[in-house]
Amino acid sequence: AAMGSCSKEYRMLLGQLQKQTDLMQDTSRLLDPYIRIQGLDIPKLREHCRESPGAFPSEETLRGLGRRGFLQTLNATLGRVLHRLADLEQHLPKAQDLERSGLNIEDLEKLQMARPNVLGLRNNVYCMAQLLDNSDMTEPTKAGRGTPQPPTPTPTSDVFQRKLEGCSFLRGYHRFMHSVGRVFSKWGESPNRSRR
């Protein structure tokens, strides 16, 4: 949904959320381009790109939250994701440098689409919370309570270490989105009913 617009139709909104999470768990949209741009596309280096434990809530944790708690957790986590993605973007090569290196500019464009897409998902999470009459969530167009911050990336002058941290974060992000999609897939046909 575009800024500020909320569908009042539960099934339509749930469908949008499922579609968005399906796209966001697809590694070809974010992790794979990041690996190529950062020169990590070598088997030995790929081995080091593992999800950091505890960086994102597990599927088990998400399932145990109930709808409102799940949406609140998702909203807060997406807030952190927006910051981490912006942080990654700051340290990506510039378009002209990519062209000089013979790397694909489309990979950079994919990476730069991630944040607006997360914003769109977060807006729909807010809309769903409104539909479920959850008054505890901050409207996405206004500043709200500070979202819990993730562990700050370890300050390091090691550019390679930073690249690996980015890679680990993105792997965790895709896994998290897969878990979110699975939770949404269990939601019932109406706001008042859940399939078990």
């Epitope: 949904a1 807030g79 910051h83 993605l85 942080d87 700051q90 914003l119």
Partner: antibody, heavy 121, light 111 residues
């Protein structure tokens, strides 16, 4: 009334350091990302740096990264800009601004009146 | 970095007439249904003041003679009926990516 008041500006020699402060009042400071924006005399506006609400994330203009450090103390409702290795081109009025809107896609809705930094020998 | 080109640099308009300021981005500042473009007014010796946020939303307390439109790379700030207090400098700002960048400014004068 929401207010931002900058201090710490002044005349400094090239290569020198200065620390700007911004005191916030009238709103819940810890709920907002904050930024520094500068304006060279008679020129346009230039974004310099932003810090997230909790202080964990910082974003910088390329030509100040490594020289400037943005920080905050939420307990004191204060924002800071530590400026090292200052250059003549850093001469400007430095404004403290509150960030609102979509996370990481903010705009600035409350501004201080600015503090003048002059870098000259 | 995204370069914001504002036009014209200076604009002379009669009081009560329409003033139109344009801002062109070197690449799109819109994505996923969002327009990350904002407009500011700056009076001499004062800090900037937000007029329009996210391309078309009027900031609270701003007169409704100000409006914004556009998407992608081209955006417009319109003052439907110029008042004496509107004769100042206007800037566009994008927040699509870091670094956020401002346009060079448009000085509005009375014809």
């Amino acid at each position: 009334e929401m207010q931002l008041v900058e201090s710490g500006g002044g005349l400094v020699q090239p290569g020198g350091s200065l620390r700007l402060s911004c005191a916030a009042s009238g709103f819940t400071f810890s709920n907002y990302a904050m930024s520094w924006v500068r304006q060279a005399p008679g020129k346009g506006l230039e974004w310099v740096a932003t810090i997230s609400d909790g202080g964990s994330f910082t974003y910088y203009l390329d030509n100040v990264r490594g020289r400037f450090t943005i920080s905050r103390d939420n307990a004191k409702n204060s924002l800071y800009l530590q400026m090292n290795s200052l250059r003549a081109e850093d001469t400007a009025v430095y404004y403290c601004a509150r960030d609102v809107g979509h996370t990481t896609f903010w705009y600035f809705d409350v501004w201080g009146r600015g503090t003048l930094v002059t870098v000259s020998s | 970095d995204i370069v914001m080109t504002q036009s014209p640099d200076s604009l002379a308009v009669s009081l009560g007439e329409r003033a139109t300021i344009n801002c062109r981005a070197s690449k799109s500042v819109s994505a996923a249904g969002y327009n990350f473009m904002h407009w500011y007014q700056q009076k001499p010796g004062q800090p900037p003041k937000v007029l329009i946020y996210y391309a078309s939303n009027l900031e609270s307390g701003v007169p409704d003679r100000f409006s914004g439109s556009g998407s992608g790379t081209d955006f417009t700030l319109t003052i439907s009926s110029l008042q004496a207090e509107d004769v100042v400098v206007y800037y566009c700002l994008h927040s699509r990516e870091f670094p956020f960048t401002f346009g060079g400014g448009t000085n509005v004068e009375i014809k």
